[in-house]
């Protein structure tokens, strides 16, 4: 299953990065699981994950790191609390969980660049 996501995203000065993860038509998928993975070298670590259903399309991902909304086969993901050391490749993984058959797809990843804000100079 094809999963599309932007190649590059620049985090805001507050350490917030948003991107859209879009998957090939869900057909009659009723339950979808979306996972954000961070790739560092050959290792992948899970940043956040959530399952949502077509009956409850809007709010999903009630998580300290990620928030998001879904609409059809698009998921709007927001990752918060990012710092310069979190710069890296973030991969969107989508699983069509129910009803069968099970499908899984992974995007090519979104390179998120995070620049720590310069500290404010002391004012006299």
């Amino acid at each position: 299953m094809h999963v599309a996501q932007p190649a590059v995203v620049l985090a805001s000065s507050r350490g917030v990065a948003s991107f859209v993860c879009e998957y090939g038509s869900s057909g009659n998928a009723a339950e979808v699981r979306v996972t954000v993975l961070r790739q560092a070298g050959s290792q992948m670590t899970e940043v956040c994950a959530a399952t949502y259903t077509v009956e409850d399309e809007l709010a999903f991902l009630d998580d300290s790191t990620c928030t998001g909304t879904s609409s059809g086969n698009k998921v709007n993901l927001t990752i918060q609390g990012l710092r310069a050391m979190d710069t890296g490749l973030y991969i969107c993984k989508v699983e069509l969980m129910y009803p069968p058959p099970y499908y899984v797809g992974m995007g090519n990843g979104t390179q998120i660049y995070v620049i720590d804000p310069e500290p404010c100079p002391d004012s006299d």
């Epitope: 038509s25 057909g27 009659n28 009723a30 339950e31 259903t53 009956e55 969980m97 129910y98 009803p99």
Partner: antibody
Framework: EIQLVQSGGDLVKPGGSVRLSCKAS????????MNWVKQAPGKGLQWMGW????????TYADDFKGRFTFSLDNAKNTAYLQINSLRAEDTAVYFC?????????WGQGTTLTVSS | DVLMTQTPLSLSVSPGEPASISCRSS???????????LEWYLQKPGQSPKLLIY???NRFSGVPDRFSGSGSGTDFTLRISRVEADDAGVYYC?????????FGGGTKLELK
């Protein structure tokens, strides 16, 4: 308002064929699977199978393989159940039902009577 | 195929009294994603079934909180804390975890 309106039930002679229809409205037809459920007189509910309204792929329960065919007309937002070589034991109320992770919406049912 | 066995076949309950219906599956109905797609429906004479409970214990919108579902693995229960006249009908459990999906045989609830 989401609705499933059924039609096509009739009195048919054994050996004949019938096509029951289920017209959906109020939602995107191709987003949800359409299921068919049989209820013989005085009996319980029997799951016949479902059709993926996006791909058109049907899944049949064992008892309904062969003489039964699920089909679609997506332009009309309608699912069909065709039964061939009708037998007396096909006499029943047939329901269509929209499924996601449950069945919140059902057709009103259509009665098929097979008798000579 | 997963056989869903409901007990009792029928029960007669006075208004205000509790009622309980059991549904047992012939094998575990935990789906591969960890969810259990076990539902309860009520059918009244001449009507289509109506959804009460999904995923074992989740009440569908508009269903009174008198209805509750519980269970895991192979044993499931629908409870009505205080039966009302409108609750009469046939109750069916349904498993949507393993194809072919299957209904229980039904339990008829009558009011005394």
């Amino acid at each position: 308002e989401i609705q499933l309106v059924q039609s096509g039930g009739d009195l048919v002679k054994p050996g004949g064929s019938v096509r029951l229809s289920c017209k959906a409205s109020g939602y995107t037809f191709t987003n949800y699977g359409m299921n068919w459920v049989k209820q013989a007189p005085g009996k319980g509910l029997q799951w016949m199978g479902w059709i993926n309204t996006y791909t058109g792929e049907p899944t049949y329960a064992d008892d309904f393989k062969g003489r039964f065919t699920f089909s679609l007309d997506n332009a009309k937002n309608t699912a069909y159940l065709q039964i061939n070589s009708l037998r007396a034991e096909d006499t029943a109320v047939y329901f269509c039902a929209r499924r996601s992770i449950y069945y919140p919406y059902w057709g009103q049912g259509t009665t098929l009577t097979v008798s000579s | 195929d997963v056989l869903m066995t409901q007990t009792p076949l029928s029960l007669s309950v006075s208004p205000g009294e509790p009622a309980s219906i059991s549904c047992r599956s012939s094998q575990s109905i935990v789906y591969s994603n960890g969810n259990t797609y076990l539902e309860w429906y009520l059918q009244k004479p001449g009507q289509s079934p109506k959804l009460l409970i999904y995923k074992v214990s989740n009440r569908f919108s508009g269903v009174p909180d008198r209805f509750s579902g519980s269970g895991s693995g192979t044993d499931f229960t629908l409870r009505i804390s205080r039966v009302e006249a409108d609750d009469a009908g046939v109750y069916y459990c349904f498993q949507g975890s393993h194809v072919p999906w299957t209904f229980g045989g039904g339990t008829k609830l009558e009011l005394k």
